[in-house]
């Protein structure tokens, strides 16, 4: 068993979250990731569900009784999801702590975006393809 | 020539981004694209760097001074990122949206913590693979 | 000041065993990935073998996979090498080295000073 | 597995420059941190530099690391060469299964 199973059922005790009630009014994550079966396009969905994780884990950083269960997850969470690769995750991060009133970053993504946008579609790597090719894709 | 293009000039000039002192002490997102080749790791990272533009149009939504450029490029990014698939566009910003200080909402984000684990490796969907294996993956 | 401190090595014949040991101190053992490392006499580092901060993932190279097992007991600080079916070519000086972080081994930042085992008849 | 690939040795004067190549054969080099040690004889390696060009306390500034996407390759570069940089450099990645050293490179001051 991974070693985060028993963590996390620690946690659920800690937020009172093993109850059946928990599961009222539907799920947020677990019925958005079972629409998506493209590797791509689920990479966009953990994308958000763990840089959700990493700010939920760090909100909770001071409580101790707590510490070890949130670094052995986070442990399996950079294992699972970045491959262990550091560089990986210090780019993702750099990415989720950019402050958006930051007046200085603003124009920095203004200044950007025009390439930004040009490399979103896959498309963007390969040569350039008809938007109107692009309309329907799934 | 995308419609993007003369909508993001127009950006430009209101963020007074045009000038080369903006590019000053690094990129924000540039760099880190330049360092992943990989689609699902480009589509890790466009992620955050798409809902960091959709929170920033958000920010200046009741300027009506750059209101057509915004929607202009929302479109684009819709066609581009997403596909021009609403059900995406949606689910991501479901997520986007989840306040990870309510107290509901972290509940929930507790109870799906150990499913949503068990997904995040691409090995997650076709069968168990040692997690020895992962150690060093890219 | 983190010290690593490696133990265990010796003259051993072809087909035995070995278990090194490595103290570690001066940091939070369990918070960070530990690897084991050789150099064969006169020659460059081989990595060997990594295991992550809470001991859940664990990595081997080719050449020592199915022989070789590390572990760690971060109840007292240690990481552990047991070597089985040693060869000649597993000769070496073998360090153990402390990661920057708890999830990758591929970030080495501190190294003991080494113990030499020698496979041999 | 990829394979990373340095010069076996370079020499140079004291006060001058040099700077020593890491190839890597397959995988993007900028998707992975790389790291250089130094060896001297009899001693255990120590990091000289970590996550590309990144600097341990207590290391002089004329040591600097950097890296190419366009020949996938990393330097590691000393300026103002002291006696006491003599000794054996490696390179150091990783990729998908496995921590991957250069073969190192033997710095002769001379």
């Known amino acids: 068993q991974d070693p985060y199973v028993k963590e996390a059922e620690n946690l659920k005790k800690y937020f009172n979250a093993g109850h059946s009630d928990v599961a009222d009014n539907g799920t947020l994550f677990l019925g958005i990731l079972k629409n998506w079966k493209e590797e791509s396009d689920r990479k966009i969905m953990q994308s958000q569900i763990v840089s959700f994780y990493f700010k939920l884990f760090k909100n909770f950083k001071d409580d101790q009784s707590i510490q070890k269960s949130v670094e052995t997850i986070k442990e399996d969470m950079n294992v699972k999801f970045f491959n262990s690769n550091k560089k990986k995750r210090d780019d993702f991060e750099k990415l989720t702590n950019y402050s958006v009133t930051d007046l200085n970053v603003q124009r920095k993504a203004i200044h950007e975006l025009i390439q930004v946008m040009a490399e979103l579609s896959p498309a963007a790597k390969t040569g350039k393809r008809k938007r109107s090719q692009m309309l329907f894709r799934g | 020539q995308d419609p993007y293009v003369k909508e993001a000039e127009n950006l430009k000039k209101y963020f007074n981004a045009g000038h080369s002192d903006v590019a000053d002490n690094g990129t924000l997102f540039l760099g880190i694209l330049k360092n992943w080749k990989e689609e699902s790791d480009r589509k890790i990272m466009q992620s955050q760097i798409v809902s960091f533009y959709f929170k920033l149009f958000k920010n200046f939504k009741d300027d009506q001074s750059i209101q057509k450029s915004v929607e202009t490029i929302k479109e684009d990014m819709n066609v581009k990122f997403f596909n021009s698939n609403k059900k995406k566009r949606d689910d991501f910003e479901k997520l986007t949206n989840y306040s990870v200080t309510d107290l509901n909402v972290q509940r929930k984000a507790i109870h799906e913590l150990i499913q949503v684990m068990a997904e995040l490796s691409p090995a997650a969907k076709t069968g168990k693979r040692k997690r020895s294996q992962m150690l060093f993956r890219g | 000041e983190v010290q690593l401190v490696e133990s265990g090595g010796g003259l051993v014949q072809p087909g035995g065993s070995l278990r090194l040991s490595c103290a570690a101190s001066g940091f939070t053992f369990s918070s960070y990935a530990m690897s084991w490392v050789r150099q064969a006499p006169g020659k460059g580092l081989e990595w060997v073998s990594a295991i992550s901060g809470s001991g859940g993932s664990t990595y081997y190279a080719d050449s020592v996979k199915g022989r070789f097992t590390i572990s760690r007991d971060n109840s007292k600080n240690t990481l552990y090498l047991q070597m089985n079916s040693l060869r000649a070519e597993d000769t070496a000086v073998y360090y153990c080295?402390?990661?920057?972080?708890?999830?990758?081994?591929?970030?080495?930042?501190?190294w003991g000073q080494g113990t030499l085992v020698t496979v041999s008849s | 597995n990829f394979m990373l690939t340095q010069p076996h040795s370079v020499s140079e004067s004291p006060g001058k420059t040099v700077t020593i190549s890491c190839t890597r054969s397959?995988?993007?080099?900028?998707?992975?941190?790389v790291q250089w040690y130094q060896q001297r004889p009899g001693s255990s390696p120590t990091t000289v530099i970590y996550e590309d060009d990144q600097r341990p306390s207590g290391v002089p500034d004329r040591f600097s690391g950097s890296i190419d996407s366009a020949s996938n390759s990393a330097s590691l570069t000393i300026s103002g060469l002291q006696t006491e940089d003599e000794a054996d450099y490696y390179c150091q990645s990783y990729d998908r299964n496995s921590l991957v050293f250069g073969g190192g490179t033997k710095l002769t001051v001379l």
């Open positions: 397959s995988g993007s080099i900028a998707s992975y941190y």
């Open positions: 080295a402390k990661d920057r972080v708890g999830y990758s081994s591929s970030l080495l930042d501190y």
